[in-house]
Amino acid sequence: VPRWRQQWSGPGTTKRFPETVLARCVKYTEIHPEMRHVDCQSVWDAFKGAFISKHPCNITEEDYQPLMKLGTQTVPCNKILLWSRIKDLAHQFTQVQRDMFTLEDTLLGYLADDLTWCGEFNTSKINYQSCPDWRKDCSNNPVSVFWKTVSRRFAEAACDVVHVMLNGSRSKIFDKNSTFGSVEVHNLQPEKVQTLEAWVIHGGREDSRDLCQDPTIKELESIISKRNIQFSCKNIYRPDKFLQCVKNPEDSSCTSEI
């Protein structure tokens, strides 16, 4: 007789999740000499311990502390790039601008990027059928709590000028409910961070509006200013050209506005 299983609204755990996490860990530690000391089998043990056998709506940041400890990593605090609703371009940027880092360029972010996972209360099984949806089921699910935890730590580590890439094609360019708006903004440390510089990425080729005047950007500026951090904003009118100019800054066309 099959066991009754909780049916959640979100997709189930990514297939071959343990193997994927382990393989990513191996790849990352091979590429990054400073993380060579990391035992990927221990990293997986800490990861599994955070969510397996636990109710997937009752996960806490504390559950992830052993994993956070094993994944402790120092990135240059003045080279941090945050992003909201524009992950692909942010990652393309740091792949070119190798001295800057998104969360997904760190070990823990790299391990979990684009993956879904959850367990079941009181069984040592991974639930591949369904996992809680943040809106429809619960916010304290394994994936959401993981990203909240690593995002908070990443923002806390930032210093000097912090950059954030925002999607100018969205109705809310700055969304208070995004991870950036709800976690990272509030965990930048005013005693370490001098300026938050927003890069608003335009979607349409003919879009010449100054999106830095958007009401949601003004809202972000207000939140940041109240936290005693300076705010600046730039329009990136041509993201394709922007990336090209990061690759080849000497190009003659790169002196004009992008």
């Epitope: 343990p18 193997e19 382990l22 393989a23 191996v26 035992d39 990927c40 089998q41 221990s42 997986w44 043990d45 800490a46 599994k48 311990g49 397996i52 056998s53 052993p66 009181n122 069984t123 040592s124 099984k125 991974i126």
Partner: antibody
Framework: EVQLVQSGAEVKKPGSSVKVSCKAS????????FSWVRQAPGQGLEWMGR????????NSAQKFQGRVTITADKSTSTAYMELSSLRSEDTAVYYC?????????????WGQGTLVTVSS | DIQMTQSPSSLSASVGDRVTITCRAS??????LAWYQQKPEKAPKSLIY???SLQSGVPSRFSGSGSGTDFTLTISSLQPEDFATYYC?????????FGQGTKVEIK
């Protein structure tokens, strides 16, 4: 039926090395991890290390680091444990044991054991 | 490393007796605990995993309980073939560690 068949007994001199093999049959070799556990005469069980053949990675107990090498050959479905700089205290039965890659379960299958005697 | 402490180290019991063996971890291991049975000159055999789940093919007289740091293996009615040494083992973190064993002997 799953079987883990280990190599035969060995007698070794102090300072030398021993390499024990564990051939798996009856299951998908690359879907599992293989640990090595030893048992000195009249003593309890001691975990030495673990290899994941699919990923080619291994770890080991700190006690054995620098002395133990755990490897696997996917083409022959065989796991290996090599212990160097042998001393008399290494005299023991060495077992290989299988668990799932995700380590969500126990060592569900064990080899028959290989007696390694270290004596001058 | 996580230390696993079993008690008693040995016990004498009769066929039909209820036998309880305890295992204590030096730090919390959730339910990442297995129990093994080992007979002389044989490899260990898995009985219980995840603290209380019975391994396939293992008689239902064996049961496990506990979580965190304190665990119990119970044999509800000891049978002649149950006289052996029993080990607990944690698989919460590396290195994997075993209890020192409990030898169940005939009274």
């Amino acid at each position: 039926e799953v079987q883990l068949v280990q190599s035969g007994a060995e007698v070794k001199k102090p300072g030398s090395s021993v390499k024990v093999s564990c051939k798996a049959s009856g299951g998908t070799f690359s879907s599992y991890a293989f640990s090595w556990v030893r048992q000195a005469p009249g003593q309890g069980l001691e975990w030495m290390g673990r290899v994941i053949p699919q990923l080619g990675i291994a770890n080991s107990a700190q006690k054995f680091q620098g002395r133990v090498t755990i490897t696997a050959d996917k083409s022959t479905s065989t796991a290996y444990m090599e212990l160097s700089s042998l001393r008399s205290e290494d005299t023991a039965v060495y077992y290989c044991a299988r668990d799932d890659i995700a380590a969500l379960g126990p060592f569900d299958y064990w080899g028959q054991g290989t007696l390694v005697t270290v004596s001058s | 490393d996580i230390q696993m402490t079993q008690s008693p180290s040995s016990l004498s019991a009769s066929v039909g007796d209820r036998v309880t063996i305890t295992c204590r971890a030096s730090q919390g291991i959730s339910s990442w605990l297995a129990w093994y049975q080992q007979k002389p000159e044989k490899a260990p055999k898995s009985l219980i995993y995840a603290a209380s789940s019975l391994q396939s093919g293992v008689p239902s007289r064996f049961s496990g309980s506990g979580s965190g740091t304190d665990f119990t293996l119970t044999i509800s009615s000891l049978q002649p073939e149950d006289f052996a040494t029993y080990y607990c083992q944690q698989y919460n973190s590396y290195p994997r560690t075993f209890g020192q064993g409990t030898k169940v002997e005939i009274k």
